[in-house]
């Protein structure tokens, strides 16, 4: 019967009692950067291509013994977990393997800068189809290999890597923490987050999604026709290749920003236990399962969107914290969040001709985030609409004045240390959605778009009692871009976005007590483009 | 149910060609391997050959390599075992066998396919 | 290439008694990374084509009687029939899957006494 994993990151229309995937991947190609492999074995004999890029460490010890089956094991089972005829994701990728670690499974930054700049050179003198490159491996953090990672991601190649074992920041490892990189972390049978000895899967914003990596059969460098069980996060980025590959075979333009946010849409959502991870990386780690698309074509009519929290401020007084979207992608929103309530609220400013999120920490507080909500929105001409703070008691408010341009996102920033706790709550105006309000002290900005077919409406909910958490979502065929809290009385911890929700944090009940005054209103814009689904109808 | 089904008895003289057949029903036919096994009057078991009909890949026995073409249409779900040019040596009961892939052995066997070569 | 020699060639047996067939490889089916003999036995019954017995040196295929099991390792393998039913009859083939050429032992026939 089908082992786990693969059924796992199957679609439930495409269930049965084997793995029968739409498309292998055929018209890819996979670069695996890693130990040698058993080239012969009959999971992937004439499927990977041994290159001759061989660039490793010496062995540890004087006593260690080279053994062909210990040194091609992590390969060849990552190789065969990919491509393998038998038990692998996309069965018709053809790979080419690179060695890059040795017997005992060590490499260099070297050795893999080398590798990855091999993959360049080939990629030049011979140009082919897509090309995913995967890299199974971790090491500490390497300001040097995370840029070799951009210069090839820019180059239109997807680069895979794992999350790193050490139940740990995927952050302070690379080239997991490379954000053009698609890191992955394991998960289990249970959708748990993996567990291997004392240490486990690596967690946090620098994952973009988990996949199964534990009791993962495939090939074993033992014997040509053996298989064996491996566990890992190299075995999870083994399987969001695989998915890749078949993404791209069927849709061979697809960008990395694309593929990335199809990723992320397609994935099983909210199914792992985040008691896992340390409590202040849960709402940072993105609780995403990778499956493959229910169908390969037609995903191109959606607005796709995810959230990117940045790193962590630091405590001190003006520290500031920013949030980046990639090339390819618009910023739709800016939002907030700081665990001790103490922020000076966000704001969507230019860097280097882009828009990022950048969020303000607090006299006395324990540091900020920024949370960029990025969409893929072709033809999009988005601007910052700025409002100072008002003289008003009615507050602030900024709306998007531009012919066909709507609200994407609002802001809100201020420069007063404390906003919240003393001032009366701001309403919003009845037939007024398409604008954002905020305090008399705070400065607003407004997000507004202009695209073919984009259409936005604000969906809102409020709770008079005080609640930790408040939640609006976006219904079906809407995607949630904005994400804000309507400023009210009670100690709003921050907003931020999960999938197609949006969530609005505020300070523990039990501080706030329990009068009107905790009163907290979710705001969310969701959106749809018209535009994108008419094109999709035409292609089909 | 799963079966494998083998195309029937065949006479032939030494020289001519022969394709025997063998249908795959019951189960995902591209998604496992068809093995091809020999067995001379009177005499034990002897594995020719292998493939995946998934990308036709083969791997032959190197007694028979040559000897045989083994191919697959998966679109029919049947695999197929050839000879350009038969000899008295080939008269034999052929059977494939359909190997699982975690433990690689033949599970589901055909009922055979018994060729006799005589001038 | 393996070469599996079995022996006896052939094994006379009382109905109701144990008959037991040896099985040796040239090398090893053993292997460490998840500790499996890669050898299964067969039986063939006039005029059938074979049907698998046992996996992995020791692993009873579903729906065989339990009368029927493997043992051994690393070289040295046995199938044991404890106690020989008229239905038995038949000749037994083991064959080791670690690595292609698959190969079989050459047979032992098993008849009642």
């Known amino acids: 019967s089908i082992p786990w994993n693969l059924e796992r990151i199957t679609p439930p229309r495409y269930r049965a009692d084997e793995y029968q995937p739409p498309d292998g991947g055929s018209l890819v190609e996979v670069y695996l950067l890693d130990t040698s492999i058993q080239s012969d074995h009959r999971e992937i004999e004439g499927r990977v291509m041994v290159t001759d890029f061989e660039n490793v460490p010496e062995e540890d010890g004087t006593r260690f013994h080279r053994q062909a089956s210990k040194c091609d094991s992590h390969g060849t089972h990552l190789a065969g977990v990919v491509s393998g005829r038998d038990a692998g994701v996309a069965k018709g990728a053809s790979m080419r393997s690179l060695r890059v670690l040795n017997c005992q499974g060590k490499g260099t930054v070297s050795g893999t800068l080398i590798g990855l700049e091999f993959i360049r050179k080939s990629q030049l003198v011979q140009p082919v189809g897509p090309l995913v490159v995967l890299l199974p491996l971790a090491g500490g953090y390497s300001r040097v290999l995370n840029a070799a990672c951009q210069r090839l991601a820019r180059a239109g190649v997807v680069l895979v890597t794992a999350a790193g074992n050490f139940r740990d920041d995927a952050c302070l490892y690379s080239p997991a923490s490379a954000p053009e990189v698609i890191t992955v972390g394991a998960t289990n049978a249970q959708d748990q987050p993996v567990t291997l000895g004392t240490l486990g899967t690596n967690f946090g914003r620098c994952v973009d999604l988990f996949a199964p990596g534990e009791d993962i059969i495939g090939a074993s460098s033992d014997c040509s026709t053996c298989f064996v069980s491996q566990s890992g996060t190299s075995q999870a980025a083994a399987h969001v290749a695989g998915i890749a590959a078949m993404m791209l075979s069927a849709e061979p333009e697809l960008t990395l920003a694309e593929l990335r946010q199809r990723l992320i849409h397609f994935s099983a959502k909210d199914v792992i236990n985040e008691a896992w991870f340390p409590e202040d990386q849960r709402v940072l780690t993105p609780n995403l399962v990778a499956a493959l698309p229910p169908s390969t074509h037609g995903a191109g009519w959606q607005l796709f969107c995810r959230t990117v929290w940045s790193a962590h401020s630091g405590p001190t007084r003006m520290a500031t914290a920013v949030a980046r979207c990639a090339p390819d992608e618009e910023l739709l929103s800016c939002s907030s969040f700081s665990r001790s309530g103490k922020r000076r609220g966000e704001r969507m400013e230019a860097q280097g001709g882009k828009l990022v999120c950048r969020a303000h920490n607090a006299f006395g507080g324990e540091g900020v985030y920024a949370i960029a909500r990025c969409c893929l929105l072709p033809q999009a001409n988005c601007s910052v609409h700025t409002a100072p703070p008002a003289e008003a008691s009615m507050g602030t408010r900024v709306h998007c004045h531009q012919q066909g341009h709507v609200l994407t996102g609002c802001s809100s920033h201020w420069e007063v240390e404390d906003l919240g706790t003393h001032k009366p709550p701001v309403l919003r105006p009845r037939g007024q959605p398409n604008q954002c309000v905020g305090h008399r002290e705070a400065s607003i900005h407004a997000s507004c778009c202009h695209a073919p077919g984009l259409e936005c409406k604000v969906k809102e909910h409020g709770i008079p009692a005080p609640q930790e958490q408040v939640t609006v979502a976006c219904e079906e065929g809407w995607t949630l871009t904005g994400c804000s809290a309507l400023p009210g009385t009670s100690h709003v911890l921050g907003a931020y976005a999960v999938d197609n929700t949006c969530v609005v944090r505020s300070r523990d009940v039990s501080t706030t007590g329990s009068t009107s005054e905790g009163a907290v209103t979710a705001v969310a814009i969701c959106c749809r483009s018209r535009h994108l689904a008419q094109a999709s109808q035409e292609l089909q | 149910q799963v079966q494998l089904v083998q195309s029937g008895a065949e006479v032939k003289k030494p020289g001519e060609s022969l394709k025997i057949s063998c249908k795959g029903s019951?189960?995902?036919?591209?998604?496992?391997?068809i093995s091809w096994v020999r067995q001379m009057p009177g005499k034990g078991l002897e594995w020719m050959g292998i493939i995946y009909p998934g990308d036709s890949y083969t791997r032959y026995s190197p007694s028979f390599q040559g000897q045989v073409t083994i191919s697959a249409d998966k679109s029919i779900s049947t695999a197929y075992l050839q000879w350009s040019s038969l000899k008295a040596s080939d008269t034999a009961m052929y059977y494939c066998a359909r190997d699982y892939w975690y433990k690689p052995l033949f599970d589901i066997w055909g009922q055979g396919t018994l060729v006799t070569v005589s001038s | 290439d393996i070469v599996m020699t079995q022996s006896p060639d052939s094994l006379a047996v009382s109905l109701g008694e144990r008959a037991t067939i040896n099985c040796r490889s040239s090398?090893?089916?053993?292997?460490?990374?998840?500790?499996?003999?890669?050898l299964a036995w067969y039986q063939q019954k006039p005029g059938q084509p074979p049907k698998l017995l046992i996996y992995?040196?020791?692993t009873r295929e579903s729906g065989v009687p339990d009368r029927f099991s493997g043992s051994g390792s690393g070289t040295d393998f046995t199938l044991t029939i404890s106690s020989l039913q008229a239905e038995d009859v038949a000749v037994y083939y083991c064959?080791?899957?670690?690595?292609?050429?698959?190969?079989f032992g050459q047979g032992t026939k098993v008849e009642i006494k």
């Open positions: 992995w040196a020791s």
């Open positions: 090398q090893s089916v053993l292997y460490s990374s998840n500790n499996k003999n890669y």
């Open positions: 064959q080791q899957y670690s690595s292609f050429p698959i190969t």
């Open positions: 019951g189960y995902s036919f591209t998604n496992y391997w």
